[in-house]
Interface confidence: medium
């Protein structure tokens, strides 16, 4: 069970995001649209599904958001790269959970992830990436909130 713990320094990720979030959110041209911030999507996740949703959202950011976003500012790009590397490390940790069959994906978890991907698909790719980056604090807060639940299950 110990190997399931996300040992990444969440505070470091949050600090990196805090330093860039206004610059990212300033480029968001769809204020009344949301991808993750419909927190209901994440709030209704049961403890059993937390590992799966975390795994899926990490994949969402690593495979879609970070790849789709084109950042011209090298200082901001460095911070985003740092967050991306932390997410890759977290993915590696969660793969160990999967190998121990502790990260089963039930229907509710799959549905929650699908909603987020659908929201993303409704926007033009660069606008969607900007908005998802701007909503990183929602995901980070959710991880923090569910961290204990996730690994005591």
């Amino acid at each position: 069970l110990r190997r399931c713990l996300i040992s990444t320094d969440m505070h470091h990720i949050e600090e990196s995001f805090q330093e860039i979030k206004r610059a990212i959110q300033a480029k968001d041209t769809f204020p009344n649209v949301t991808i993750l911030s419909t927190l209901e999507t994440l709030q209704i996740i049961k403890p059993l599904d937390v590992c799966c949703v975390t795994k899926n959202l990490l994949a969402f950011y690593v495979d879609r958001v970070f790849k789709d976003h084109q950042e011209p500012n090298p200082k901001i790009l460095r911070k985003i790269s740092s967050i991306a590397n932390s997410f890759l490390y977290m993915q590696k940790t969660l793969r160990q959970c999967q190998e121990q069959r502790q990260c089963h994906c039930r229907q509710e978890a799959t549905n929650a992830t699908r909603v987020i991907h659908d929201n993303y698909d409704q926007l033009e790719v660069h606008a969607a990436a900007i908005k998802s980056l701007g909503e990183l604090d929602v995901f980070l807060a959710w991880i923090n909130k569910n961290h204990e639940v996730m690994f005591s299950a």
């Epitope: 805090q18 610059a23 204020p31 009344n32």
Partner: antibody, heavy 120, light 111 residues
């Protein structure tokens, strides 16, 4: 968490002045929009400029303020507004504010203001 | 620059009444609009952001609506403490500019 403006006072026409916005209880190391807004006596609010205190350092100005006003982050707790070629029309209370347009995460925060009087 | 036109300039209503303040932008600003309350000698206080989202600690008697060019602030069940000047403010940004223009303000007198 508080903001406080300083540096106001009496200045001659065509003179210059630098106002300072000082944060306490939080740091400008994180990314916030820190903006300057002014209010002439008995008049409405007028936006001057904003700066992203994070790594981007992006600055934005009202069209009419560009060139005469300069917003800068000078330390992890201070943001300044440099004003040049001042006229009587610049007489106002100058406010600094954090995230003036609101956010689900951070509350909007304003200083009490500092009065600038341009007169000979 | 975006012009924000606020109406009326002044309104007087009794305690318990309802006040409606309108704000019109010179171009579409989506829902990038905030409402502020200011009392004499005090800095402005944010009431509503993103056109309709209540800021923290603001009572639900305050309601914002609208998008595009037309916006409304409605204050219901008026209290004496609501006597103040109210401002709308756009915070619209393009790729290389921002506009944070304020409306001219509406003075609310509570009788």
């Amino acid at each position: 968490q508080q903001l406080e403006e300083s540096g106001g006072g009496l200045v001659q026409p065509e003179g210059s002045l630098t106002l300072t916005c000082t944060a306490s209880g939080f740091s400008f190391s994180s990314s916030y929009w820190i903006c300057w807004v002014r209010q002439a006596p008995g008049k409405g609010l007028e936006w001057l400029a904003c700066i992203d205190t994070g790594v981007s350092g992006d600055t934005y100005y009202a069209n009419w303020a560009e060139g005469r006003f300069t917003i800068s982050k000078t330390s992890s707790t201070t943001v300044t507004l440099q004003m040049t070629s001042l006229t009587a029309a610049d007489t106002a209370t100058y406010f600094c504010a954090r995230d003036i347009f609101g956010s689900a995460i951070d509350n909007s925060l304003w200083g009490p203001g500092t009065l600038v009087t341009v007169s000979s | 620059a975006i012009d924000m036109t606020q109406t009326p300039a002044s309104v007087s209503e009794p305690v318990g009444g309802t006040v409606t303040i309108k704000c019109q932008a010179s171009q579409s600003i989506s829902s990038y609009l905030a409402w502020y309350q200011q009392k004499p000698g005090q800095p402005p206080k944010l009431l509503i952001y993103s056109a309709s989202t209540l800021a923290s600690g603001v009572p639900s008697r305050f309601r914002g609506s609208g998008s595009g060019r037309e916006f409304t602030l409605t204050i219901s069940d008026l209290e004496c403490a609501d006597a103040a000047t109210y401002y709308c403010q756009c915070h619209y940004h393009g790729s290389s500019y921002w506009d944070n223009s304020f409306g001219g303000g509406t003075e609310v007198v509570v009788k």
